[in-house]
């Protein structure tokens, strides 16, 4: 009779994380008598992942009854793969012996490779606000993928960036991976309403890449223009003077009226308008009573935004230019902010 | 091809910790054993030790009580530490990989790192 | 341990002839499942060693046909068809079959 050979048919399984792997073995022959034994590796080192005749092996079940006389299909199926599992399995055949068993043929292995889906990938911006024209920095992290090789992509605004430097951790051999990537965007004005989105693609996720992203408006800051104009009133007395703030972002602001340097009104911005790119307008004006002046009056809007220093735009009232009211001393009424939308 | 290469001190005192890396490029560490061989100045080879990918280590057991072998797979090196140097440890150290296909034995140290020269003086 | 004896210890070559090298172990190296786990090295002047043949009698990648290993158990045998210039060196045979891995005390062969 032929002497027994041990066959492994599958040179190579792949399994997903979480499945059941199936390492297939068969026996030529019912002789020499002797148990099966499965390894994971070779040579002194090897693992022991099941003995037939002893032992405890949770995860591990055979395909067929090996109690059964003329069986010849020793394969197994090991439960719940972790990226951990990976590695090359033998199937060995022992000869019964005194007093123990002695091996006798392995098959020619199994290589057995575990695919772990990455995680979801978490973008982050900088910790502090920026304005246009800076280039700021995103980073994007996933973790978890195996095997090693992943695609990663950056996109603001469904535009891919080229700026970006990523590196998949570690460069030598391990169970499971992770990328890290930093990429470089340049702000514009415009960018409040922009996405700028991290896009990794692996193997497990069947051409379905996933995606994280973050919002431009946690990052921008967009610095306001000023405007001071002067209209006349109905009264000749009085000046009427706004200070127009435009597109600015984010809503928080502060703006402070001084009259020949000394603060007038101080009022925040509360009900604004906000324009299309995302940014907002406010306006605010200042009823000035000419006659309580001798000379020109230097009127200053001055404008605190999101806690940087503050930004000023100065207009001259040329006072000589109004007819004075006897007997008022009101320089300017406390009138609160213009409401409506001047555009 | 895979490449080893052995980086550490060249001169050690006596009594002092021998430490020395060994750098795999070019292939996978797993399914191999990693292994530290020494020859003696006009002598022949003497195994040291080997560690396997799964972090099992095997030691002369001459040298077991001085030397630890260990793996760091995420940045490809193996490493070995001796304590305890005297001068009958000065050699050149080669790092080594050990092949296994199947059983209990090996096939054979197929890859070799071109040696690093230890030196055990005052 | 697993001691291995090699002979002779000096060998005088002429290039284009015949050489051969002795190994024995003091256990077999002939493992249950037929296999059996004897190497041969070279260790050219200078260099590493280099794998010349394993499994008693395979050759290694990129190993010239000139050399061939057999022998089985205990005694083993490397032969060179014809000694060329760059084979001059030390030989040693390693048994794989149990820790610690144990060599040969080497031959020196040299061009006569």
């Known amino acids: 009779e032929e002497e027994l050979q041990v066959i492994q048919p599958d040179k190579s399984v792949l399994v997903a994380a979480g499945e059941t792997a199936t390492l297939r073995c068969t026996a030529t022959s019912l002789i020499p008598v002797g148990p099966i034994q499965w390894f994971r590796g070779a040579g002194p080192g090897r693992e022991l992942i099941y003995n037939q005749k002893e032992g405890h092996f949770p995860r591990v079940t055979t395909v067929s009854d090996l109690t059964k006389r003329n069986n010849m299909d020793f394969s197994i199926r090991i439960g719940n793969i972790t990226p951990a599992d990976a590695g090359t399995y033998y199937c060995v055949k022992f000869r019964k012996g005194s007093p123990d068993n002695v091996e006798f043929k392995s098959g020619a292995g199994t290589e057995l490779s575990v695919r772990a889906k990455p995680s979801a990938p978490v973008v982050s911006g900088p910790a502090a606000r920026a304005t246009p024209q800076h280039t700021v920095s995103f980073t994007c992290e996933s973790h978890g993928f195996s095997p090693r090789d992943i695609t990663l992509k950056w996109f603001k605004n469904g535009n891919e960036l080229s700026d970006f430097q990523t590196n998949v951790d570690p460069v030598g051999e391990s169970v499971s991976y992770s990328i890290h990537s930093t990429a470089k965007v340049v702000l514009t004005r415009e960018d409040v309403h922009s996405q700028v989105i991290c896009e990794v693609a692996h193997v497990t996720l069947q051409g379905d890449p996933l995606r994280g992203t973050a919002n431009l408006s946690e990052t921008i800051r967009v610095p306001p223009t000023l405007e001071v104009t002067q209209q006349p009133v109905r009264a000749e007395n009085q000046v009427n003077v706004t200070c127009q703030v435009r597109k600015f972002y984010p809503q928080r602001l502060q703006l402070t009226w001084l009259e020949n340097g000394n603060v007038s009104r101080t009022e925040t911005a509360s009900t604004v308008t906000e324009n299309k790119d995302g940014t907002y307008n406010w306006m605010s004006w200042l009823l000035v009573n000419v006659s309580a002046h001798r000379d020109d009056v230097k009127l200053t809007c001055q404008v605190e935004h999101d806690g940087q220093p503050a930004v000023s735009k100065s207009h001259d009232l040329k006072v000589s230019a109004h007819p004075k009211e006897q007997g008022s001393n009101t320089a300017a009424e406390n009138t609160g902010s213009n409401e409506r939308n001047i555009y | 091809q895979v490449q080893l290469q052995e980086s550490g001190p060249g001169l050690v005192k006596p009594s002092e910790t021998l430490s020395l890396t060994c750098t795999v490029s070019?292939?996978?560490?797993?399914?191999?054993?990693w292994s530290w061989i020494r020859q003696p100045p006009g002598k022949g080879l003497e195994w040291i030790g080997f560690?396997?990918?799964?972090?099992?280590?095997f030691y002369q057991s001459s040298l077991k009580s001085r030397v630890t072998i260990s793996l760091d797979t995420s940045k490809n090196q193996f490493s070995l530490k001796m304590t305890s140097v005297t001068a009958a440890d000065t050699a050149v150290y080669y790092c080594?990989?050990?092949?296994?296909?199947?059983?209990?034995?090996?096939?054979?140290?197929?890859?070799w790192g071109q040696g690093t020269t230890v030196t055990v003086s005052s | 341990d697993i001691v291995m004896t090699q002979s002779p210890l000096s060998l005088p070559v002429t290039p284009g002839e015949p050489a051969s090298i002795s190994c024995r172990s003091s256990q077999s190296l002939l493992y249950s499942t037929g296999y059996t786990y004897l190497d041969w090295y070279l260790q050219r002047p200078g260099q590493s060693p280099q794998l010349l043949i394993y499994?008693?009698?395979s050759r290694a990648s990129g190993v010239p046909d000139r050399f061939s290993g057999s022998g089985s158990g205990t005694d083993f045998t490397l032969k060179i068809s014809r000694v060329e210039a760059e084979d001059v060196g030390v030989f040693y045979c390693g048994q794989a079959l149990q820790t610690p891995l144990t060599f040969g005390q080497g031959t020196k062969v040299e061009i006569k």
């Open positions: 560690i396997y990918y799964n972090g099992r280590t």
């Open positions: 070019g292939g996978s560490i797993r399914d191999y054993y």
């Open positions: 080594a990989r050990v092949r296994a296909y199947s059983g209990i034995g090996l096939d054979g140290t197929d890859v």
């Open positions: 499994g008693g009698s």
